[in-house]
């Protein structure tokens, strides 16, 4: 009879064990364990009748199709085998054990005692068959195994082979290289790769297989396993496989599909191809005169582009439009997109006008083409070129007039400063009891008239100022402060300010230049109570033309000490010139005591300590700050006075040979102008040089050379 056993382990004994087994007996034990296991069988006791080749009694161990062992006897001989310590292993999950005894037993034999157990199969070690083993990695576990893949691969649905996702490859460049996955390593199994070459219409794709070509094939059947197919429109080329690469393929199309198929077996290295776009050829090109074509090639094909450029000093001219370069392209029909343009010499055209300057052509016929030369010069002696520039400009290859230092910027003609058209005399009387100034002696002198119509009644007063440039007047802040009923500092409205330049006699303003104000700028820290920071600027509505009677004064260098004691300076003004007129009288009589003709005086700078002491001895708050200096004589008699306010106190600078504004008429008192030991107090301009340049919007370097030449 047959016994079915399905447990993972068990015991099998001969009938009647441990007693002797009966004669003429046959029992079969069929052991089945789950897949992934095999059966291990061993005997703890074995005692059967001996016979030649186990013909009488035996134990036979077999699988479905194979006898694994036949045992009999008590000990192993040449012709019979006992299990002893031997273990029988089934190859699969089934084992059949048959015990048989014949009709007669000469002795009593006790039979056998056997044990079996299910043991795990290590499929990863044991599977030799490529059809069953894992493609990349094998992982064993009790009762089974599973496969996995290297990075970039996907496990196929057969759970064994590793494929790649390669169905979405698009190539749009005009040349390229396409390979099988992992080339030159063996390509993955079970994969369907699709490569699309999609070029612009007008190109044709040429394919060429290179290097190794190794695709699994078959000796009789054409490419049954792995293959390449090339699809061009409706036409399919291939399949291709084996070790011989296809010949170069001219597809005559701009769109090509390459299909690569691999099955679940084989170890082949794959393939590599290069592709390149071909197009129609365009005619040969001739570069223009004075020009060149880049790139220079023997042949040009569809989509090739060339850049036409001209030699230095020439411009590309196309349809009357000048340009630096011009690009043309080889079209798909084999023609060029445009005709070759011409090269025309660069023309800088008429140079820009220079304010207060002249232009001279150095090249014959007043040529303005490439490499022509011009020279700018300033209207001397009233203007001088900034930084002593040569003024020479050359027509550049870019079509602009260029100077070695300034580039394309025009030079600047700066007003010459501190150089009167007539020399100032050494002997000078005073403004008080004064001396008339000759026209042109003080060309920087400005008369500032303020008519404040916002006041009730309207207010009118005047002061002096000094021309710093064609557009800016320097004066005292108190001249341009609204005459308010409190001590708040508010500038007068620019609409209420008129500036006269080149004025000599106030009765005759016909020869003078009068200008209105564009801006009135008081020093932000001007203090009405002590006149500290008594400095201001007026920007003129329009720059004034310079000439013998209108020229700027120079600003000093930045030096906190100011002018040295005892240095002599000149001051001019139209203020009170009659020593018998008192301050109170001028206040009450308005402008009637204005001097008709410009007066001037020569005054020495007073040591600061002496001036401070002279004012501290008076009643009232008369502080002389570090932003002020004094000038005048101890004995009096020569002084500036009311109406001279804001006028320039100028000192001749030996280094630059120019007149420099060191002070501005600010205040004095409380005694009458020209009184004994009443020094005139002046704003120390050298403390404000940076502020002045900042307001005028010019860097200091612009003017320093003017003073230090």
């Amino acid at each position: 009879h047959t016994v079915e056993l399905n447990n993972m382990f068990g015991q099998i004994q001969s009938p009647g064990y441990p007693d002797s087994y009966p004669s003429d007996s046959e029992v079969t034990w069929n052991i089945t364990v789950p897949d992934g296991f095999r059966i291990k069988l061993y005997f703890m006791h074995f005692n059967l009748e001996s016979s030649y080749l186990c013909e009488y009694d035996y134990v036979k161990v077999e699988t479905e199709d194979q006898v694994l062992a036949t045992f009999c006897g008590r000990e192993t001989t040449d012709t019979e085998q006992t299990p002893g310590q031997e273990v029988v292993l089934s190859p699969g999950s089934f084992m059949s054990i048959t015990f048989r005894s014949d009709f007669s037993n000469e002795e009593r034999f006790t039979g056998f005692d056997a044990h079996y157990m299910a043991v795990d199969v290590d499929e990863c070690k044991e599977r030799e068959d490529e059809e069953l083993s894992c493609d990349h990695y094998c992982h064993n576990y009790i009762g089974g195994y599973y496969c996995s893949c290297r990075f970039g691969y996907i496990l196929h649905t057969d759970n064994r082979t590793c494929r790649v996702e390669c169905s979405d490859n698009l190539f749009t460049q005009r040349t390229g290289v396409i390979t099988s996955p992992d080339f030159p390593n063996p390509y993955p199994k079970s994969s369907e790769c699709l490569y699309t070459i999609e070029l612009e219409e007008g190109f044709m794709v040429n394919l060429q297989f290179e290097d190794i070509f190794d695709i699994e094939d078959h000796p009789e059947v054409p490419c049954p396993y792995d293959y390449i197919k090339i699809k061009v429109g409706p036409k399919v080329l291939g399949p291709f496989c084996g070790e011989k690469a296809p010949e170069p393929i001219s597809t005559q199309s701009h769109s090509v599909l390459i299909l690569f198929h691999s099955d679940n077996s084989g170890e082949n290295r794959g393939w590599r191809l290069s592709y390149r776009a071909a197009g129609n050829e365009c005619p040969e090109l001739q570069p223009p005169v004075h020009g060149k074509i880049e790139p220079s090639q023997a042949k040009y094909f569809f989509k090739d582009q060339v850049l036409v450029s001209c030699d230095t000093g020439y411009k590309v001219l196309k349809d009357n439009v000048e340009m630096d370069t011009f690009q043309i392209e080889c079209l798909k029909d084999g023609t060029w997109s445009n005709k070759i343009p011409t090269c025309k010499i660069v023309d800088c055209r008429a140079p820009g006008e220079l304010e207060h300057g002249l232009i001279t052509f150095s090249t014959r016929n007043n040529l303005t083409t490439y490499k022509s030369e011009i020279k700018y010069s300033c209207q001397e002696p009233y203007y001088k070129m900034l930084n002593n520039n040569t003024g020479i400009y050359t027509c550049s290859a870019q079509g602009v007039w260029m100077n070695k230092v300034l580039g394309r910027s025009l030079p600047t003609c700066l007003p010459e400063c501190g150089q009167p058209s007539r020399s100032l005399p050494s002997l000078v009387k005073r403004i008080i009891g004064g001396r008339n100034a000759e026209p042109g002696l003080f060309p920087w002198q400005a008369l500032i008239v303020v008519e404040d119509t916002s006041r009730v009644p309207n207010d009118k007063w005047f002061g002096s100022g000094a021309l710093l440039s064609a557009s800016w007047i320097l004066t005292a802040a108190h001249v341009l402060r609204s005459q308010r009923r409190d001590t708040t500092v508010i500038p007068v409205s620019k609409e209420h300010v008129t500036v006269y330049l080149g004025l000599h006699d106030v009765r005759d303003k016909s020869g003078a230049v009068n200008s209105s104000a564009a801006r009135v700028v008081l020093h932000p820290d001007f203090n009405i109570q002590n006149y500290n920071h008594d400095i201001a600027l007026v920007q003129l509505q329009e720059p004034v033309p310079l000439g013998p009677h209108v020229m700027p004064v120079c600003l000093p260098r930045l030096e906190p000490e100011g002018p040295a004691p005892h240095m002599l300076g000149l001051v001019a003004g139209w203020g009170i010139s009659n020593p018998n007129v008192t301050v109170d009288e001028i206040i009450s009589s308005g402008t009637r005591t204005l001097s008709d003709v410009l007066q001037y005086v020569k005054l020495p700078v007073v040591p600061h300590a002496e001036c401070k002491t002279s004012y501290e001895s008076r009643s009232g708050n008369y502080s002389v700050t570090e932003n002020m200096f004094c000038a005048g004589y101890y004995e009096g008699g020569k002084d500036t006075c009311l109406g001279d306010s804001g006028g320039a106190f100028v000192i001749f600078d030996d280094l630059s040979q120019r007149w420099v504004v060191q002070g501005l008429v600010s205040w004095g008192g409380p005694e009458e102008c020209g009184s004994k030991q009443v020094y005139g107090v002046y704003t120390k301009v050298s403390n404000y040089v940076d502020w002045v340049w900042e307001q005028m919007g010019l860097p200091q370097s612009v003017v320093e050379p003017q003073v230090e030449r």
Partner: antibody
Framework: QVQLVQSGAEVKKPGASVKVSCKAS????????INWVRQAPGQGLEWIGW????????KYNDKFKDRATLTVDTSSNTAYMELSSLRSEDTAVYYC???????WGQGTLVTVSS | DIVMTQSPDSLAVSLGERATINCKSS????????????LAWYQQKPGQPPKLLIY???TRESGVPDRFSGSGSGTDFTLTISSLQAEDVAVYYC????????FGQGTKVEIK
């Protein structure tokens, strides 16, 4: 002719803020300053502060500098005085004046009461 | 801060008589540079804003009758109404504008 027209009377609770406006016409608003002065019932005049519309410069009486804010809107030629953290003693008529006190607004009564 | 003190607090004057109001400042209001005293006088009638009469201590505002005059310098100033008229009944204030602004406490002028 020059006119300064102030906003209407206000009643406020202690701790609140009030903003009084002063609209100028008849002269160039940015060329002169605006002063603010107040007068408590039956009391004298007290200067609050000053603003110059051209550059927004301000000056304040120390007594008010933490609570008063003076501003201008040059597009509408209007000056504003805002007083915060009101208390009952801020009850007063508030005046604006311009062109150095030549012209005055009609006054705005601000009553602070709980 | 500059303190302004007016005297008397009130004043009763017959019509056509002279009225004098004094104002004293705690520091000088004379600016030595401009030679001006920064003091103004105002008149205020009930229910009206103040009206400027005098500035720079002695300069009359345009449109102000010449019976009003100002004098003084430094710290002591006077407003004089040379011949009191009925319409002059008001409170008069002095104000310094030398350093910010400060008003005096006011002087009430009535007809006797």
């Amino acid at each position: 002719q020059v006119q300064l027209v102030q906003s209407g009377a206000e009643v406020k609770k202690p701790g609140a803020s009030v903003k009084v406006s002063c609209k100028a016409s008849g002269y160039t608003f940015t060329t002169d300053d605006i002063n603010w002065v107040r007068q408590a019932p039956g009391q004298g005049l007290e200067w609050i502060g000053w603003i110059y519309p051209r550059d927004d410069r301000t000056k304040y009486n120390d007594k008010f500098k933490d609570r008063a804010t003076l501003t201008v809107d040059t597009s509408s030629n209007t000056a504003y005085m805002e007083l915060s953290s009101l208390r009952s003693e801020d009850t007063a008529v508030y005046y604006c004046s311009s062109l150095e006190d030549t012209y005055w607004g009609q006054g705005t009564l601000v009553t602070v009461s709980s | 801060d500059i303190v302004m003190t007016q005297s008397p607090d009130s004043l009763a004057v017959s019509l056509g008589e002279r009225a004098t109001i004094n104002c004293k400042s705690s520091q000088s209001l004379l600016a030595s540079r401009t030679r001006k005293n920064y003091l103004a006088w105002y008149q205020q009638k009930p229910g009206q804003p103040p009206k400027l009469l005098i500035y720079w201590a002695s300069t009359r505002e345009s449109g102000v009758p010449d019976r009003f005059s100002g004098s003084g310098s430094g710290t002591d100033f006077t407003l004089t109404i040379s011949s009191l008229q009925a319409e002059d009944v008001a409170v008069y204030y002095c104000k310094q504008s030398y350093n910010l602004y400060t008003f005096g406490q006011g002087t009430k002028v009535e007809i006797k």
